[in-house]
């Protein structure tokens, strides 16, 4: 396993609809044709997998149908979007990139993006 640099933004604020987007960029050390991207969430020293996708270079990034993540790839950067976020989902979201094929295998883990999610205030009842 060889190490690889990964960059991602330090902080992102989710929209009022609970959507957060960020870029994950990796320093590809060679001609990888198969790449796996995983988003991990770290909160209270617990790390959980949020979503993962494997893609072939030049093809679309596809997550599972029930995934809360969507994304697009362009060269050695991936644009990730996480949906359905609530205030309790605030945490550090880490981008993990693996160059699966051809060998050698490379692994890169970003420093994480702190995503802040604020639940919208309910609209007050109007008297009309």
């Amino acid at each position: 396993c060889k190490a690889m640099h990964v960059a991602q933004p330090a902080v992102v604020l989710a929209s009022s609809r609970g959507i957060a987007s960020f870029v994950c960029e990796y320093a590809s050390p060679g001609k990888a044709t198969e790449v796996r991207v995983t988003v991990l969430r770290q909160a209270d020293s617990q790390v959980t997998e949020v979503c993962a996708a494997t893609y072939m270079m030049g093809n679309e990034l596809t997550f599972l149908d029930d995934s809360i993540c969507t994304g697009t790839s362009s060269g050695n950067q991936v644009n990730l979007t996480i949906q359905g976020l609530r205030a309790m989902d605030t945490g550090l979201y880490i981008c993990k990139v693996e160059l699966m094929y051809p060998p050698p295998y490379y692994l890169g883990i970003g420093n994480g993006t702190q995503i802040y999610v604020i639940d919208p205030e309910p609209c007050p009842d109007s008297d009309f």
Epitope: Q8, E25, Y26, A27, T33, G75, N76
Partner: nanobody, 126 residues
Framework: EVQLVESGGGLVQPGGSLRLSCAAS????????VGWFRQAPGKEREELAC????????DYPGSVKGRFTISRDNAKNTVYLQMNSLRAEDTAVYYC???????????????????WGQGTQVTVSS
């Protein structure tokens, strides 16, 4: 859209040095990571070096590490490849390529670059 033009190639004796330039027009190069590649007749394109947007991140394959150095001058919209201790097997057409990125990294994979120059010939011979 950015356009790239390489220069600085030519005939050099074994053991000699050359500095190649990759000049950009049509856009500011500081938005792009830049890579240098070469292709010898009948061979696959080979990665040589890359440099991130700010110049703080560079990467080289083991084959040229220590002999080749990449640098950039964003004020001049130019990226350079300094090549030392040249050998006959360094004879090839040398290309630079650019990729618009968000952060400071770069890639050694030709698959990641979408803008390429026309190339400059380097011949190492006595």
């Amino acid at each position: 859209e950015v356009q790239l033009v390489e220069s600085g190639g030519g005939l050099v004796q074994p053991g000699g040095s050359l500095r190649l330039s990759c000049a950009a027009s049509g856009d500011t190069l500081e938005s792009f990571a830049v890579g240098w590649f070469r292709q010898a007749p009948g061979k696959e394109r080979e990665e040589l070096a890359c440099i991130g947007r700010t110049g703080e991140f560079t990467d080289y394959p083991g084959s040229v590490k220590g002999r080749f150095t990449i640098s950039r001058d964003n004020a001049k919209n130019t990226v350079y490849l300094q090549m030392n201790s040249l050998r006959a097997e360094d004879t090839a057409v040398y290309y630079c390529a650019a990729e618009r990125l968000v952060f400071h990294l770069c890639s050694l994979s030709e698959y990641d670059y979408d803008t390429w120059g026309q190339g400059t010939q380097v011949t190492v011979s006595s």
